[in-house]
Structure formats: C-alpha cells, structure tokens
C-alpha cells in the first residue's frame, strides 16, 4: 500500500454530503451504495461515517461530466470513472463520479418495476422468456405495448415480473397528476401516437394525458427508458425501437447479429434496413459501490496499490463479496489504527442537528409499488397480462415545467432610490440576509440594501437600493421576505417581528405571537405559497401552514421540514419561491425543490430536491 503525502483526517468521525445524483440509479440505491462503500472501510478501521446535508462535510460527493468545476475534467464514457482528492479542507477529500458512465450495481442498468408480482424488485438482465434471452424490457407477449421484464433470470421458470417505467403506466412532473399518456393525442392540430419533443426546446419527451392537449392543456413528461437508451452508433441518446427489422428479420430485443465483437445493438427506428439508424445497447455499467469504495479509500488518504487484487489497484474489475485485500486493510490501519470503532455519535455540525430520528434520506425515485387491487394474471402467451389502468402516484417533481423561462420584468417600485458605487457588488456577498421574488424580480437583501435581478438579457442586475427608501419602516437586517402571489402584499420578517406592505402602506411591526407562534420561534426563515391564500411558514427545521388572509398559523399543522422537503438543510436560513421552484439557502448554497403549489397534492407529500448550487453563481449569475 501507499499513502498520500502522509495526509489523513485528524478525526475519526467522518462526515459526507451527497451533493447531487446520477439518473442511472434510483436515489435510495445511490444512497445505499455510498453508505456501503464507507462501511467497507469502517469495518476494518476505527472510523464512522455520518451523512450530513451541507458543504461543510469532510467528503463532498458529486456527479459531474467533462469540466465540472475542478482542474481535472472527466473524459466521457469509460476511461476515467471517478476521481478523489486526498484529505483536507475545501475540495480536498471530495469524491467526484463521471456521470458519462453508466452507473449500476455492476450487472447492467437498474430498472425499478411497478405492479406485477415482484414488489418493485428491479429487472434482472438478461432474462429468459419463452426460451429467448432479453437484455432490456420488452413488449413481447403483450398486445398493449407496455414494456415489462422478469425480475429473476428465468421468467419461464419463476414467473416473476414487473412493468418497466413507461408512459403507458405514468408520466412525471407537468400538470397531468402523473396519469399515463393518452395515445393518440392532439397537439397543435396534429395527432401524436408516441411521446414527442415538439413544442419544447429542451429535448424533454412529453405527451398529453387526455386525448386533446389543445383543448385540455394537460400533459406530463415521459419516463426515461434507461434500459433502451443507446450509446454510440449514429443515434446516441435515442431509444431502441422494438421490434425492429434487420436483414429482413424481426428483433424484439438487443442483438449481436451482424457484429464480430459480440456487442449488443438495436435499431432506433422500426426498420434498420431502410433507415440505418442504430446504437449500442447499455452495457453492464460500473458498480457504483466498488468505484465509490476505491475513491473513498483515496479520500481517506490511501494512494494506489501495486497489488492487482487490492481494491486500491488502479484498474476497475467487477467482483462480488467483501472487496478489501490485506494490502488495503494494512494501508487504512496504518493511517487510522486497528482499534475498535469510536462512539458513533454524529459530529456537532450545523446541518445534522436536531434530528431526533435518522437524518432524512433523499426521496427515492421509485413510486409506491402497491399491488393493484386485481392481481394480474399470466396471459395465454406466457407474458404478464396488463396491469391496472390506474397508475402509481406521480414520482418526485424534478423536471422543468413549461411556461415562461423568465419572470415578467418588474415595474419601477423604487421611489427615488439612489445607487451605491459600482464597487458594492452583490457577487462579493457571502450570505444574503433575505432573498425574495417581488413583482417578478428576484430581490437580494443585505445590511439595509437590496439588489434586483431581472432574468433577461441586457442589464439584469439593478441596485443597490436603500431598503428603507422603498419600504420605510424596515430594519436594516432582515430574516426573510415574501410576496403573496394573489394580493401582491409583501411580508418582511426580522427577529420576532413582521411587517406587511400593500404598496407603500405598512401594517406592523407585529409580534410573531400574533401569528400564533410561541416564544421558541425566534425568527421566520421564509414562506412558500400554497393554493387558495395559504402558505408554508418555516423556522428552525419546522414548518407550519399559514393563512395569508388572517395571518395566523395553524398550530396543529407543525411538522419537521424533512417530512415535507426531504434532503434540504433543516437549518436553512432563507427560504423562498422563484419561478415555481422552492429554494432553501444555507451559507452560500441553495437547494432547489420542485413542487406544484396549484395542484391539489396530498398533504405532506415529500418534495424532491432537483438541484444544488451557489446563490451568487447560479441565481445571480455572477461570473
């Protein structure tokens, strides 16, 4: 073994933060792969690993592609799979994974299933059905076009199956409440019998969830078929089309016919002979667990090993079972000793307390896999017969919803505001006091001044303006601000006081007592609008329902933030809505959550983090 410049962590309770995710695996599987990868080292050395939810973690885990913010760009598929930095502050100790790889458990793409009789178990590839081998979901044996797979190696023997993610089962995001696509559907007078990207510039495939989009305006996004998304060839990123014709013969799954190298491929139209469009089918992928265990070895201070059987050897090979070799164990014990594990109490970091139960994990992307009320039967052809017509509840809302890409520009609400010198640059502000969308512009408040950010070309940034000039009664330091989308009243909070502005008229300051908040609530960190004059009010890891008209909280409604918004910092100091997304700020960073405040969603449905970024670079678009 070799160590890295003698560098190691000076403490044994290591914290880690999963900053973002790959689309290749369900989030709970990614969480689990990382937890198991850390546990490998914790088994043989006196180390504990605690997941936290902020950038102060020792080891920040990130998926990225090509140039991803450090000096070591990734190189596309294969080759360099991931990299890690040795222990230390900042980027040191972090582990980055190349998201141009196919991340799996080492045995092919992981496809969760729905309904069927396997309780959500992932597909098993390859599987045998009627004596043939399948390496992707198939519609064979069905007449409704719904793709399915076996969840064991042999469907003929075991009869275990589930339905693959498909627009025929459900859609994601949009406003169609997760209902399946309706085919054909009408869009701009034309009929569509498959998902389309028409009308969108971002490439997302969508469909109508009623027969007529023009009339009903209801839609959803089509689930990605990762089992059938090709790489290479001349159609990278397109979906396999099954069945397809090659040399006059029909194929219902990927094939190696016509190739000497044995690689599986498919056509991306129904007829290869005429269209010549094709790509390689997804391969076995790389085990996220094994690669992570190797990278975490680096992040703990181990350099590469010259022992080919060691986990720290610099070449990837898939293996099952406990991955450490004696050389790996000797190395980690040289750095951290052999002693028993330390007391597994979480470190006193600001983002892990107080969480009386286990810290929240990101909402898994697998919707509930409840059995349908009528269990499907096996049809005469041996394939599973259609499942229920009702779809599973919609998945987390993470994709962009359509609508204007920029908010309406704000009118000039500043009464003779005066600008500071250009040197007062908001890009130099580490942490803003409050951020809020007011009159369509994002307002950034700091120390009695504010800037307005209009998301359009030209000069999007205005200010700084004196806060007290525009809203005369306000103190210099604010905790949060919020504009009621219905009445356009603006709420400001500072300490235990609230001010409400209607234009220039102010009501307040009012004590938080008047809102029904007890003395333990020392500040309000933000509000998010809900339908029909309601909002969510946040403070110190808790959230209440708040009536904007009566300006009272419902004391019975209080819950922990992570029950409703999984994966955001419990102690976010500023929470606001912008362009129909909720933002939770902690330090220089924000966690963005997609949620639909107009749609009647089930109370306490866990909303999904879909982005993490810098307030200055990503929201203010600082250079």
């Amino acid at each position: 073994f070799q160590t890295f410049k003698g560098l190691k962590w000076d403490h044994h309770n290591i914290t880690y933060w999963i900053q973002n995710y790959s689309e290749d695996l369900p989030r709970d599987m990614i969480d689990d792969a990382f937890a198991r990868a850390f546990a490998v080292w914790g088994e043989v050395a006196p180390l504990t690993f605690t997941r936290v939810y902020g950038p102060e973690a020792d080891i920040v885990i990130q998926f990225g592609v090509a140039e991803h913010g450090d000096g070591y760009p990734f190189d596309g598929k294969d080759g360099l799979l991931a990299h890690a930095f040795p222990p230390g502050a900042g980027v040191q100790g972090d582990a980055h994974f190349d998201d141009d790889e196919l991340w799996s458990l080492g045995k092919g793409v992981v496809i969760p299933t729905y309904y069927g009789n396997s309780n959500g178990a992932p597909c098993h590839f390859p599987f045998t059905f009627e004596g043939r081998s399948y390496s992707a979901c198939t519609t064979d044996g069905r007449n409704d076009g719904t793709p399915w797979c076996s969840t064991t190696a042999d469907y003929d023997k075991d009869g275990k199956f589930g339905f693959c993610p498909s627009e025929r089962l459900y859609t994601e995001h949009g406003n169609g409440e997760g209902k399946p696509c309706v085919f054909p559907f009408i869009f701009e007078g034309r009929s569509y019998s498959a998902c389309t990207t028409k009308g969108r510039s971002d490439g997302y495939r969508w469909c109508a969830t009623t027969a007529n989009y023009d009339q009903d305006k209801l839609y959803g996004f089509c689930p990605t078929r990762v089992d059938a998304t090709v790489v290479g060839g001349n159609s990278a990123g397109e979906l396999c089309v099954f069945p397809f014709v090659f040399l006059g013969k029909q194929y219902s799954s990927c094939t190696s016919d016509g190739r000497r190298d044995g690689r599986l491929w498919c056509a991306t139209t129904s007829n290869f002979d005429t269209d010549k469009k094709w790509g390689f089918c997804p391969d076995q992928g790389y085990s996220l667990f094994l690669v992570a265990a190797h990278e975490f070895g680096h992040a703990l201070g181990l350099d590469h090993s010259s022992v080919p059987e060691a986990l720290m050897y610099p070449l990837y090979s898939y293996l099952e079972g406990f991955p450490l070799n004696k050389d790996d164990i000797d190395g980690i014990q040289y750095l951290y000793g052999r002693g028993s594990k330390p007391d597994p109490r979480p470190p006193a970091t600001t983002t892990t307390e107080p969480q009386p139960t286990a810290p929240p994990t990101m909402c898994p992307t697998i919707p509930p896999t409840a059995y349908p009320t009528v269990g499907p039967t096996v049809g005469p052809t041996g394939a599973p017969s259609p499942g229920p017509t009702s779809s599973p509840s919609p998945g987390p809302t993470g994709a962009p919803s359509p609508g204007p890409t920029a908010p309406p520009t704000a009118g000039s609400s500043e009464a003779s505001t005066e600008s500071l010198s250009p040197a007062d640059n908001p890009c130099n502000v580490d942490v803003f006091d409050a951020i809020a969308e007011i009159q369509g512009a994002l307002h950034f408040f700091k120390d009695g001044w504010y800037w307005k950010f209009l998301n359009h070309r030209g000069s999007p940034l205005q200010g700084p303006f004196l806060t007290a000039r525009t809203w005369p009664a306000l103190p210099a330091t604010l905790d949060s601000a919020f504009e009621d989308p219905q009445t356009k009243r603006v709420f400001f909070f500072s300490g235990r006081q609230m001010w409400v502005y209607t234009g220039k008229t102010v009501l307040g300051p009012r004590s938080l007592d008047k809102l029904g908040l007890g003395p333990e609530v020392t500040h309000v960190s933000g509000l998010l609008p809900r339908r029909l004059g309601k909002a969510l009010l946040f403070s110190k890891g808790r959230v209440w329902r708040f009536d904007l008209k009566s300006q009272k909280v419902d004391p019975q409604s209080v819950i922990r933030v992570d029950k409703e918004f999984s994966g955001v910092p419990w102690n976010s100091h500023d929470i606001f809505q912008y362009q129909d997304k909720a933002y939770f700020c902690h330090g220089k960073f924000f966690w963005r959550v997609s949620f639909q405040n107009e749609v009647n969603k089930v109370d306490h449905e866990v909303n999904q983090v879909d982005d993490v970024g810098y307030v200055t670079y990503d929201l203010l678009q600082c250079p």
Epitope: F4, K5, L7, E67, G69, D70, G71, Y72, P73, D75, G76, D78, G79, L80, L81, A82, H83, A84, F85, P86, G88, G90, V91, Q92, H294, E295, H298, D303, H304, P314
Partner: antibody, heavy 124, light 107 residues
Framework: EVQLLESGGGLVQPGGSLRLSCAAS???????DMWWVRQAPGKGLEWVS?????????FYADSVKGRFTISRDNSKNTLYLQMNSLRAEDTAVYYC?????????????????WGQGTLVTVSS | EIVLTQSPATLSLSPGERATLSCRAS??????LAWYQQKPGQAPRLLIY???YRATGIPARFSGSGSGTDFTLTISSLEPEDFAVYYC?????????FGQGTRLEIK
Amino acid sequence: EVQLLESGGGLVQPGGSLRLSCAASGFTFSWYDMWWVRQAPGKGLEWVSVIYSSGGPTFYADSVKGRFTISRDNSKNTLYLQMNSLRAEDTAVYYCAKDRAYGDYVGWNGFDYWGQGTLVTVSS
Amino acid sequence: EIVLTQSPATLSLSPGERATLSCRASQSISSFLAWYQQKPGQAPRLLIYDASYRATGIPARFSGSGSGTDFTLTISSLEPEDFAVYYCQQRGNWPITFGQGTRLEIK
C-alpha cells in the same frame, strides 16, 4: 531513472504538418496523464494538450483545437502530437511532460518530469 | 480561465539574500499551485507542488506557501545556481494556466 525524449521538430512552412514523438522510460507510462507544453522564443509556458492515462478523450488549448491531435501508444511508451495547418505563431520549443497525478487520485498538481524539448519553426 | 499574475517581473538580489516571489490567482484555486524553475536552454524543473510540498531532490532553501488566491515562493538564502526564471502554474480550475514568470537575476 525517468526520461522523456522528444523528437520530430524542425522547420516547416505555414499550412504544413509535423508529428512530434516523446519516448518515455523509467516509469509505468500507461498509468500517467501526459502533456505537451510549448514555449515561444523569449516567452512563457503555454499548455497545448493532455491525454489521460486511459488514452481516451483528449483536451486541447483553444489556440490549437482542431489542428493538433495528441495520442499515445502505451505498448511503446510513446506520446505523440500530430500538428496540422501550422501557423507562424506555433513556432516554439515543444516539451512533453509527465503529470505528477495519475488516474483518479488527483491531489497532486505539477509536472514532475519534462523532456529536453524539440524546436518547431513555422516560417516561409 | 484563471489568470495567474506573478510579481515582480524581475527581482535583482545577491547570493545569500532571501528571495520572495509572489503569484496571485484571479480566483480561488485552493492549494493547486506548482512552482517551476527554468534556466536558459533547459526544460522547466518542478520545485513545489500543491503550494507547499517540495518535489523530490529540491533543496530545503526552497519553500512554498499560500492558499486560495495568494501564493509565495521563498528562497531563504540564494545560491548562484538559483538565478533563473520562475513560473507558477495552477490546476484549481480548468484549463491549467501558467504565470508570466519572474526573472531572478544577480544584482
């Protein structure tokens, strides 16, 4: 002992081509990222291109993108730079350099071994 | 891209004196900075990697310090063979960049 030996430089007319080679010895060549760095007469250092140990996708400075191609033959322990459509401003001493980092452990920063350089002169 | 500014452009000192060379980055690069020495007609030689670690075979009179945006190369007591051009190079962000160099000459 680590050694890097460049060859292939010379005088070429604008629009012409040259292929530089760098023979490596004394280390496990296939494990390390390799770089070309150039230095115009009397000027500072400028990175030209890098190829990762995997030999996969490569990276180029904007000034040479589309004209230069870096490659490596790990079985021969040799790094190459194919230079096409040469311009007068490409005149420089070209060095091959070994990255101190290798593979996925990226704490190192620095080029710990350099070749002696080969002069490329582009002139009519 | 990150710009590295070295100062002074030229430093005139006598053997035995202490030399302090500066390299400033246009944005934070953590500790991803290296220092090289180049003598006329020779290839650059790595002195310091990761801001403060001496490369193999480099005498102890050379030391590096700094983190973020401000970095310093110090030669505690100049020897005649130390008079050369010194370059800093960053890899805190892509693409890598070099400073314009500081010429250390005999006074």
